[in-house]
């Protein structure tokens, strides 16, 4: 499956929007840093089948969408930027869904890569728990925004590697 050229442009736009969501100087938030245990192994090449990679990427973007579409995120972040961010993520999801269906068929994919998908879900659960424990403070959002930017960048790198293998 060939992801459209607009897909990588959408990735870049999503990253720019994440960067623009900054509300306070991050320098005041050093003490709030947290290890979310990003599931790096799910984004390494290993013996990754393309279909598995696409499923993991889809889950990553879906969970990012979920995280940023809560009422707490709407209260903490710029709504105009959030709306643009949702549009970009929605397009990413559509692109990847088309790919998943082409690669493995819609029935098999969620079951075949359950462990990888579960690892991504648990990662986002840790992020949500952190935000809850920190009472959705400005610094907590700043830390999460930085973390999502990092994980998003790693997702983009995985997509680039997939493309180069075609």
């Amino acid at each position: 499956c060939d992801l459209p050229q607009t897909h990588s442009l959408g990735n870049r736009r999503a990253l720019i929007l994440l960067a623009q969501m900054r509300r306070i100087s991050p320098f005041s938030c050093l003490k709030d840093r947290h290890d979310f245990e990003f599931p790096q192994e799910e984004f390494d090449d290993k013996q990754f089948q393309k279909a598995q990679a696409i499923s993991v990427l889809h889950e990553m973007i879906q969970q990012t969408f979920n995280l940023f579409s809560t009422k707490d995120s709407s209260a903490a972040l710029d709504e105009t930027l959030l709306d643009e961010f949702y549009i970009e993520l929605d397009q990413q999801l559509n692109d990847l869904e088309s790919c998943v269906m082409q690669e493995v068929g819609v029935i098999e994919s969620p079951l075949m890569y359950e462990d990888s998908i579960l690892a991504v879900r648990k990662y986002f659960q840790r992020i949500t728990l952190y935000l809850t424990e920190k009472k959705y403070s400005s610094c907590a959002w700043e830390v999460v925004r930085a973390e999502i930017m990092r994980s998003f960048s790693l997702s983009i790198n995985l997509q680039k590697r997939l493309k180069s293998k075609e």
Epitope: A19, R22, S25, P26, F27, S28, C29, L30, K31, D32, R33, H34, D35, F36, E142, V143, A146, E147, M149, R150, S153
Partner: antibody
Framework: EVQLVQSGAEVKKPGESLKISCKGS????????IGWVRQMPGKGLEWMGI????????AYSPSFQGQVTISADKSISTAYLQWSSLKASDTAMYYC??????????????WGQGTLVTVSS | DIQMTQSPSSLSASVGDRVTITCRAS??????LNWYQQKPGKAPKLLIY???SLQSGVPSRFSGSGSGTDFTLTISSLQPEDFATYYC?????????FGQGTKVEIK
């Protein structure tokens, strides 16, 4: 390979201006902050300030606030440290180092080789 | 500002010795404490981050412990290349601050 390459040694007179540089390569320059550290002859390490190259947001140590300016040009992956009017007491080795920002990763894991600044009349 | 106090300021030791350097913060800094090694004419090198995590490529004879205000860097068996100055540094808050350094010399 991650590298921070600093500009060469400088010999200046008191009152002169100076801008030294730190060029990052082998990683995403805007994904890390760049910190500056001073080491006067025979002395310890002193943190001067830091910059987020993604938007040029800066923070300074109170000891250096107003004495130096930290800037960055992300288009050429370079951070700068500058003085508008040097003093003899600015004679020191200056290091840049990368910092992971708010990400859970090692602080100051890569350092530049240092720029020796000598201020003498 | 958070003050970082290292002790001792210098120490003499022999190859094979176990060496311990301590660092005390003026207020609790959690585990946001790093250790660096610096040799004359060279840039500092990160050894330990987040109080106890060994930086990639650093020999396992180096270890770090502590949290809150009291921290320790231990070299289990001193090697000839370990004679250097060691600095602790807090990254809990801005301004970031370093300890004054501990010089490890040959006995």
């Amino acid at each position: 390979e991650v590298q921070l390459v600093q500009s060469g040694a400088e010999v200046k007179k008191p009152g002169e201006s100076l801008k030294i540089s730190c060029k990052g390569s082998g990683y995403s320059f805007t994904s890390y902050w760049i910190g500056w550290v001073r080491q006067m002859p025979g002395k310890g390490l002193e943190w001067m300030g830091i910059i987020d190259p993604s938007d040029s947001d800066t923070a300074y140590s109170p000891s250096f606030q107003g004495q130096v300016t930290i800037s960055a040009d992300k288009s050429i992956s370079t951070a700068y440290l500058q003085w508008s009017s040097l003093k003899a007491s600015d004679t020191a080795m200056y290091y840049c180092a990368r910092h992971p920002g708010l990400n859970w990763a090692p602080d100051f894991d890569y350092w530049g080789q240092g720029t020796l600044v000598t201020v003498s009349s | 500002d958070i003050q970082m106090t290292q002790s001792p300021s210098s120490l003499s030791a022999s190859v094979g010795d176990r060496v311990t350097i301590t660092c005390r913060a003026s207020q609790s800094i959690g585990s946001f404490l790093n250790w660096y090694q610096q040799k004359p004419g060279k840039a500092p090198k990160l050894l330990i981050y987040f109080a106890s995590s060994l930086q990639s490529g650093v020999p396992s004879r180096f270890s770090g412990s502590g949290s809150g205000t009291d921290f320790t860097l231990t070299i289990s068996s001193l090697q000839p290349e370990d004679f250097a100055t060691y600095y602790c540094q807090q990254s809990y808050s801005i301004p970031i601050t370093f300890g004054q350094g501990t010089k490890v010399e040959i006995k």
